[in-house]
Interface confidence: medium
Amino acid sequence: AWELTILHTNDVHSRLEQTSEDSSKCVNASRCMGGVARLFTKVQQIRRAEPNVLLLDAGDQYQGTIWFTVYKGAEVAHFMNALRYDAMALGNHEFDNGVEGLIEPLLKEAKFPILSANIKAKGPLASQISGLYLPYKVLPVGDEVVGIVGYTSKETPFLSNPGTNLVFEDEITALQPEVDKLKTLNVNKIIALGHSGFEMDKLIAQKVRGVDVVVGGHSNTFLYTGNPPSKEVPAGKYPFIVTSDDGRKVPVVQAYAFGKYLGYLKIEFDERGNVISSHGNPILLNSSIPEDPSIKADINKWRIKLDNYSTQELGKTIVYLDGSSQSCRFRECNMGNLICDAMINNNLRHTDEMFWNHVSMCILNGGGIRSPIDERNNGTITWENLAAVLPFGGTFDLVQLKGSTLKKAFEHSVHRYGQSTGEFLQVGGIHVVYDLSRKPGDRVVKLDVLCTKCRVPSYDPLKMDEVYKVILPNFLANGGDGFQMIKDELLRHDSGDQDINVVSTYISKMKVIYPAVEGRIKFSTGSH
């Protein structure tokens, strides 16, 4: 028997520095977790103790903090090189700055293979990107070889900016021939490493013949065997065992997100490459694990110029941006309109001639807006200003919901109106009318939504049985502020870009902004 240790990360999202327990900015260092310096300490410890170790990343290193805003992926290449990753799969967020923003900082600079079998380049891009990412890679590990085959969410064109010269194929259809090729090369230990979410990971384990282990990402799935060490609630045991169509037991793993855990899976293979046993658990990277001093020093060096970024002008406002709780928790506020407009603008993807855009709606809990911005400071808006408005380090995500769920959400928005509670929704691409004289749960008297399958966008009544795409904060997607119906009834959830980054990009693009209160939210006469 031959034993392999798989160390894995996914959805790190630019958390190069240690973070608080909820993966936001580290405040009290003695309670902080993760970060590449701490990760390196643990990885090196395991490399010294065990003979056959692979360090893998399942995508979405890009996007999430000011590190990515400034360094655009160069920080990913540098620190992944320093940690000596063995392979990485492409995630959807790796395309956030277009193909060029992937090729230059990461693909050309990475000293490890970057993989995806289901992304095919065409046209002029084919020769430009040739060899910079691969469908699979055979890695020598000790006296053996291990094949790693990559995959990426086929939804990427709707979630990011891969352009028109990359085709995202069905994962299972694309993976099978590559695995077959590895078999003909006498590679009998094969890991599928990819970024399509836990459901697809399980399908790959079930359907792709010859895959021994699946290491996934995208859904931020936390798996754990035994008592979990922090706040995350396990979605299943680690590893999650799937019985394949040809009768094999295939371990599937994922390691939550944000570099908080290091996935740790031990696999025993027989001489024919069959998995005999698999066991392990994610390792919580808490403060009991010291940060490696050399990597920490390197982090501090790269930081020098980040601090200055926060105070630089992104653009100007010529109006007061009312982000006060007195406004945003009671009525339409122009800060809410600005943020929602930025959220929609960030998700413009013209992927189908029938649709002007794939999504037109935004909802945003008023309690998530934490500060106004005064235009009398020469109109200047800085990252620092936006960090006061959106201090929680969240993301603006894409969900699919039925109309009936949206209706429930808007009823919840005003079910206890008047108490300055955070669930009052700010909107974009939605016109809502409330009648507060009616009883809670029956206060939404009009709910019109902007069409997407139209050449001239207009507002139509919400249809209860129709499925709609909506951009919203991850906080709401996870059921925050009492929006349990969103969490329980959502049909799809894809994590998006860092909230501040979305708004800062929009302001930089617009240069001068003047959001108004324009009747998106109304109260019927006599009730307000």
Epitope: V70, K72, P105, K108, E109, N300, K301, K305
Partner: antibody, heavy 120, light 111 residues
Framework: QVQLVQSGAEVEKPGASVKVSCKAS????????ITWVRQAPGQGLEWMGD????????NYNEKFKTRVTITADKSTSTAYMELSSLRSEDTAVYYC???????????????WGQGTLVTV | AIQLTQSPSSLSASVGDRVTITCRAS??????????MHWYQQKPGQAPRLLIY???NLESGVPSRFSGSGSGTDFTFTISSLEAEDAATYYC?????????FGQGTKVEIK
């Protein structure tokens, strides 16, 4: 090999503006900071500011903040430094330089352009 | 801004001499085990050339007679055995915080 090639000498009148270019080759332009440094005749080196071409992020020396604009064009791997409201004391050689980056982010200036003499 | 003071401002030495230049910072430029001090050589009519980075690391292609040391606020640049081609002005520069500043320079002449 890494090269930074700057535009030619300029003679400008007081109050005018000057824009100096710096074309980079031989490395990934978007992944390293470009710094601008000037040197008046017979004087020392003065750090003016820098740009990260990957994001367009800039930092300026307070002394020049209101008059200098540093930009970068990723498509041509060219950085620019524009200085406005020129006065006689701006007569100097203006250098662009590449900062160390991916191997050690120490911000030492490891490659320099040949310099552009601006006479006001 | 951090001020850097070089001394001496000029010196004259013979070929084969050991030459030492010091650079004092008005504030610590060391942290996390790194000292953000660099040394450059500039010959008349030429652009500066990086010799030493992070206080003591020799840039590739630079002769080993050049060296640097120091931490905190006090740094030293040494030419162990002066050669005729070393006649130039030498500058220290810090990159600990913005703005990055240079010392005023030390002119080295050959006797």
């Amino acid at each position: 090999q890494v090269q930074l090639v700057q535009s030619g000498a300029e003679v400008e009148k007081p109050g005018a503006s000057v824009k100096v270019s710096c074309k980079a080759s031989g490395y990934t332009f978007t992944s390293y900071w470009i710094t601008w440094v000037r040197q008046a005749p017979g004087q020392g080196l003065e750090w003016m500011g820098d740009i990260y071409p990957g994001s367009g992020n800039t930092n300026y020396n307070e002394k020049f903040k209101t008059r200098v604009t540093i930009t970068a064009d990723k498509s041509t791997s060219t950085a620019y430094m524009e200085l406005s409201s020129l006065r006689s004391e701006d007569t100097a050689v203006y250098y662009c330089a590449k900062e160390g980056g991916l191997t050690t982010e120490d911000y030492a200036l490891d490659y320099w352009g040949q310099g552009t003499l601006v006479t006001v | 801004a951090i001020q850097l003071t070089q001394s001496p401002s000029s010196l004259s030495a013979s070929v084969g001499d050991r030459v030492t230049i010091t650079c004092r910072a008005s504030k610590q430029v060391s942290t996390s085990g790194y000292s953000y001090m660099h040394w450059y050589q500039q010959k008349p009519g030429q652009a500066p050339r990086l010799l030493i980075y992070l206080a003591s690391n020799l840039e590739s292609g630079v002769p080993s007679r050049f060296s640097g040391s120091g931490s905190g606020t006090d740094f030293t640049f040494t030419i162990s055995s002066l050669e005729a081609e070393d006649a130039a002005t030498y500058y220290c520069q810090h990159s600990r915080e913005l703005p990055f500043t240079f010392g005023q320079g030390t002119k080295v002449e050959i006797k």
